[in-house]
Amino acid sequence: EKLPKAPVITTPLETVDALVEEVATFMCAVESYPQPEISWTRNKILIKLFDTRYSIRENGQLLTILSVEDSDDGIYCCTANNGVGGAVESCGALQVKMKPKITRPPINVKIIEGLKAVLPCTTMGNPKPSVSWIKGDSALRENSRIAVLESGSLRIHNVQKEDAGQYRCVAKNSLGTAYSKLVKLEVEVFARILRAPESHNVTFGSFVTLRCTAIGMPVPTISWIENGNAVSSGSIQENVKDRVIDSRLQLFITKPGLYTCIATNKHGEKFSTAKAAATVSIAEWSKSQKESKGYCAQYRGEVCDAVLVKDSLVFFNTSYPDPEEAQELLIHTAWNELKAVSPLCRPAAEALLCNHLFQECSPGVLPTPMPICREYCLAVKELFCAKEWLAMEGKTHRGLYRSGMHFLPVPECSKLPSMHQDPTACTRLPYLDYKKENITTFPSITSSKPSVDIPNLPASTSSFAVSPAYSMT
């Protein structure tokens, strides 16, 4: 007859490494008499005999985890007790090793140029995987804008057009490598006008083509507005190449108009818009067209505030749906263009433009605009702005003064009334009157009319030959 013997664990539990979905076994060999009862715990919680995820064999000495999950990680203990002496226990750890797995892969992203983009790449694995990124066919290099975050996500600050492309993340540890699917980063660019339409001064019944070129991502659409409304007549031709759209509007001109090119593209739920405006004016008005529709009112704008005669009434042309707005936008566009001209020319040109676009007005049954006096127009053209005028004259339509793609709506001096014929029929430019007070160096002008000073000019210009047409009495 055997003598009773307290349990002794002859093979203590060891740390077991196991891969996910593989089998892991703990051995707890016990010598004792009588045969002991063996129980198993994981993290001090009893493993039930009927738990189908486990197999307990060899009288409880063998614990097998049939398909390891990452949540099986922990401390496993076996306890043997046969009523003789005390119970004995041995413990060992299960370390679940895991090939890299991408739990939150990157997704396709559309982002506006200049914003921040984040492509996610969350991983699992043991040992912890390292994450790198591939753009196109080559490894992505980090720099001051581009960084791989601790989480594995890729962050790109101030996204540029060249960041667009296909990306994938790579998770790697000692057990293997995982690749995400390729995702696309699309960089959207706000609509921008590359070439604004140019203004034209044409005869009644002419054909004019206005051209507007815009760029953006996605490629913008271009629409045309005539005096605040959608263009009602005229044909539009469009051409798209790369990310550039070129739109040409052909018009048959029967009335003056303000034409606006609007380039629009969509970014998610939002739109970006760029605008450029041009005028089409009619050079020679026939008698019937001269009875122009318009009204006299106070000038409320900003651009010409310092130039126009204080508290005078000016003419607003109702061929525009909102004359005040249209004329102010025109003068604003023209004014910006004057930043490039000489200090001598600029104030004179500003005076000319403001008094041309906002002509002094005589209210009455038929409100009548008063054009600028020819002599003042010629003084600006051939004295103050002679150099600028000559430089531009060869490159432009008659009656238009352009610089680059922009325009200045300047009157044709020869068509204006002379102050000598009817001093009440035209407007003087106060700026020029003011300047002529200070003249000491300019030669006197001989004319059949009384001799008069010309607007002030530097001494170096005193050798100019000046025609009597300028004399301002």
Partner: antibody
Framework: EVQLLESGGGLVQPGGSLRLSCAAS????????MSWVRQAPGKGLEWVSA????????YYKESVKGRFTISRDNSKNTLYLQMNSLRAEDTAVYYC??????????????WGQGTLVTVSS | QTVVTQEPSFSVSPGGTVTLTCGLS?????????PDWYQQTPGQAPRTLIY???SRHSGVPDRFSGSILGNKAALTITGAQADDESDYYC????????????FGGGTKLTVL
């Protein structure tokens, strides 16, 4: 839909300062003149200041000249009113209002809900 | 200093017509003052009705119309309704010396 949302109002002591902001949405902010209009409790409307679309010029009611400064940040779609040397008579609801066009003095065609400024010791 | 004048109060019967006026303490109101009209109900922000003398703001019923009557700007409401009971303000562009915008004192309209 045009929306104007004023903020920055509150209680301030005489001589103190406040900066009101007006966040605009639903229209191309940079294409419109803007104004501040105030209304003292139980009183009528009083125009305070105006600024055109590009902010080049600024206009003020005589009694606030030198104390108030209107400005705009078209990139942020925001209008501001910096109010210094505040007086008891500046107590009012301050409305931000959109002008009908680019110029500073077009009609006021959209209004915010207002922010209350109380100047009291 | 020029003051913009309005009737302090006015009453009208439902369905009736009323004309509110806006004048200057010295001088006449002209279209160069670009008269604007605003409606305000208690506790609410103002609402634009008429701008530049006679242009109706979008969404404003055609019962409201603006004009120059003699030397004053006028707002006429035809077929008055109960919800027209409000304060009405005119606004004028003023341009002597420096640019300015001035509101009238307002007219309290009661629909009896």
């Amino acid at each position: 839909e045009v929306q104007l949302l004023e903020s920055g109002g509150g209680l301030v002591q005489p001589g103190g300062s406040l900066r009101l902001s007006c966040a605009a949405s639903g229209f191309t902010f940079s294409d419109y003149g803007m104004s501040w209009v105030r209304q003292a409790p139980g009183k009528g409307l009083e125009w305070v200041s105006a600024i055109p679309w590009q902010g080049g010029s600024t206009y003020y009611k005589e009694s606030v000249k030198g104390r108030f400064t209107i400005s705009r940040d078209n990139s942020k779609n925001t209008l501001y009113l910096q109010m210094n040397s505040l007086r008891a008579e500046d107590t009012a609801v301050y409305y931000c209002a959109k002008r009908s066009g680019r110029i500073a003095f077009g009609a006021l065609d959209a209004w915010g809900q207002g922010t209350l400024v109380t100047v009291s010791s | 200093q020029t003051v913009v004048t309005q009737e302090p109060s006015f009453s009208v019967s439902p369905g009736g017509t009323v004309t509110l006026t806006c004048g200057l303490s010295s001088g006449s109101v002209t279209s160069s003052n670009y008269p604007d009209w605003y409606q305000q109900t208690p506790g609410q922000a103002p609402r634009t009705l008429i701008y530049s003398t006679d242009s109706r703001h979008s969404g404003v019923p055609d019962r409201f119309s603006g004009s120059i009557l003699g030397n004053k700007a006028a707002l006429t409401i035809t077929g008055a309704q109960a919800d027209d009971e409000s304060d009405y303000y005119c606004g004028l562009y003023m341009y002597s010396g420096s640019k300015n915008y001035v509101f009238g004192g307002g007219t309290k309209l009661t629909v009896l």
